[in-house]
């Protein structure tokens, strides 16, 4: 990680992708520590952009503007050398977001995938972006970059992610950029949560008073397991959104969540999954599907008194 003997390592915290108006800490790690250092921005010339200022440990840059986007290097203090400074560090690209309209991000075949599968994340826009960038929340590495393919007034790029394992689960966003300002990125796409299933044992799903109910009768679906899941996720076939509830320890040592569906008006096939707070985007195997049938006079939909989660937010903790 530290590079060569006389080469410092420049890194950015929390990320190299910074929103306009945000702040980023640049750290120059040299010779097993954070010494005094100088920063350079590579604007065609290797001149200190910060007027020869010397920094200690880290430099907090911001509020950032589009002009801050670009490639940075540092030199560590080396008092007994000829120049007094080390060789230049690795290049570090800082990308500033919020400069163009946001693109859209889709998952094919979908955002809920089994461990080992591959997912295509397609970033697209009717803004003619030259490059698309894909970034996973909480990751400090550079985003993946692809050239946009333009057809019928739409620019798009397909990012292949896989084979999926827990480390790849999480919240993804994509950005676009135009040629003359490759590191001045667009506003972020709406977040897309990629969830990996099949990592833990399946919970069981049951219905109270039972899987066959009269129209208008209140129905509750209970998801439970001996595994100490923190959260249960309930999905209905054909519905984009899942509901989630905190698991509650029961006297019989199971962990359970009860999803009240309200007065039954419409049947459907339900599944539930368990997950742990530490890895909110890594889910258990699916429960066996539970078919809920409504006898009587079914209407077109089932009201949901519990607010379903949005298409994103799955990978955030429940507070």
């Amino acid at each position: 990680l530290m590079g060569g003997q006389d080469k410092p390592f420049l890194s950015a915290r929390p990320s190299t992708v910074v929103p306009r108006g945000g702040h980023v800490a640049l750290q120059c790690h040299y010779r097993r520590g954070f010494n005094n250092f100088m920063l350079y921005k590579e604007d065609r010339s290797h001149v200190p952009i910060f007027h020869g200022r010397i920094f200690q440990e880290s430099f907090i840059m911001g509020p950032v503007t589009p002009a801050h986007a670009g490639t940075y290097r540092c030199r560590g203090s080396r008092p007994h050398s000829l120049t007094g400074w080390s060789a230049p560090s690795n290049p570090l690209v800082i990308m500033v977001t919020g400069n163009h309209r946001k693109p859209s991000l889709l998952a094919h075949p979908g955002p809920l995938l089994k461990s080992g599968e591959t997912v295509i994340l397609q970033c697209w826009s009717d803004v003619m972006f030259e490059h698309f960038f894909l970034h996973r929340e909480g990751i400090s590495e550079d985003p993946s970059r692809l050239v946009g393919q333009i057809h019928d007034g739409v620019s798009k790029a397909n990012f292949s992610i896989g084979p999926l394992m827990p480390v790849l689960a999480g919240t993804y966003r994509c950005y676009g950029s135009v040629p003359h300002s490759p590191y001045q990125l667009s506003a972020p796409s709406d977040p897309l949560d990629i969830v990996i299933t099949g990592l833990y044992e399946k919970p069981s799903l049951s219905a109270q008073p039972g899987p066959t109910v009269q129209a208008g009768e209140n129905v509750t679906l209970s998801c439970s397991s001996w595994s100490s899941y923190d959260i249960y996720h309930l999905s209905r076939e054909g519905e984009a959104h899942e509901r989630r509830l905190r698991a509650v320890p029961k006297v019989n040592r199971t962990f359970q969540a009860d999803f009240p569906l309200g007065p039954a008006t419409h049947g459907g096939t339900y599944r539930c999954f368990g997950s742990f707070r530490a890895l909110p985007c890594v889910w258990s195997n699916s429960s066996d599907p539970l078919l809920v049938s409504v006898t009587g006079n079914p209407s077109s939909s089932w009201p949901s008194p519990t607010e379903p989660s949005s298409k994103s937010g799955i990978c955030r903790h429940l507070h």
Partner: antibody, heavy 112, light 107 residues
Framework: QLVQSGPELKNPGETVKISCKAS????????MNWVKQAPGKGLKWMGW????????TYADDFKGRFAFSLETSASTAYLQINNLKNEDTATYFC????????WGQGTLVTVS | DIKMTQSPSSMYASLGERVTITCKAS??????LSWFQQKPGKSPKTLIY???RLVDGVPSRFSGSGSGQDYSLTISSLDYEDMGIYYC?????????FGGGTKLEIE
């Protein structure tokens, strides 16, 4: 398409403001470029304005007396030239997108 | 600034002839090059972007090629309506810069 305002005849020292009205696409999708063409001469890029953020960028020769602005609600970009000089006599074009995909018909400004 | 050197500055060609115009950049422009055609008293018309991509509606006799610093526009079979002035533009780096233009006339 991009439709520009009509020709202007001005005296030296005056100000001119040219408009460029966009239609048929989402205005904030594409930056708006401005290009100067003096009579019998080639094309010269003046700069661009980011229609999403409103930030203008000027080429060195067009810093100072030149100003790009937007009226996003009307899908219109403007070029204003202050303190006009004889050498500003030219046709001014607006063109949108990173590779100047579509152009306005041009506005002839005569300073005399 | 990146300098775009276009050649020839003017040329005569016959109908049906194959015509090539070249543009040389003072540094690598990563294929971020457009070609335009301008007729007298009209605004420029975009023919090609990203060095090789034909804009919708532009006749297929036009083609672009090149990479790095050297680029060319070819008209495979010259048509009467192709006369005009042709410009290249680099959009890799600000400020954008145009070539000086090539005046194409029919002989």
């Amino acid at each position: 398409q991009l439709v520009q305002s009509g020709p202007e005849l001005k005296n030296p020292g005056e100000t001119v403001k040219i408009s460029c009205k966009a239609s048929g696409y989402t205005f904030t999708n594409y930056g708006m470029n401005w290009v100067k063409q003096a009579p019998g001469k080639g094309l010269k890029w003046m700069g661009w304005i980011n229609t999403y953020t409103g930030e203008p960028t000027y080429a060195d020769d067009f810093k100072g007396r030149f100003a790009f602005s937007l009226e996003t609600s009307a899908s219109t970009a403007y070029l204003q030239i202050n303190n006009l000089k004889n050498e500003d006599t030219a046709t001014y074009f607006c063109a949108h997108g990173p590779w100047l995909a579509y152009w306005g018909q041009g506005t002839l400004v005569t300073v005399s | 600034d990146i300098k775009m050197t276009q050649s020839p500055s003017s040329m005569y060609a016959s109908l049906g002839e194959r015509v090539t115009i070249t543009c040389k950049a003072s540094q690598d422009i990563n294929v971020y090059l457009s070609w335009f055609q301008q007729k007298p008293g009209k605004s420029p018309k975009t023919l090609i972007y990203r060095a090789i991509r034909l804009v919708d509606g532009v006749p297929s006799r036009f083609s672009g090629s090149g990479s790095g610093q050297d680029y060319s526009l070819t008209i495979s079979s010259l048509d009467y309506e192709d006369m005009g002035i042709y410009y290249c533009l680099q959009y890799d780096e600000l400020p954008y810069t145009f070539g000086g233009g090539t005046k194409l006339e029919i002989e």
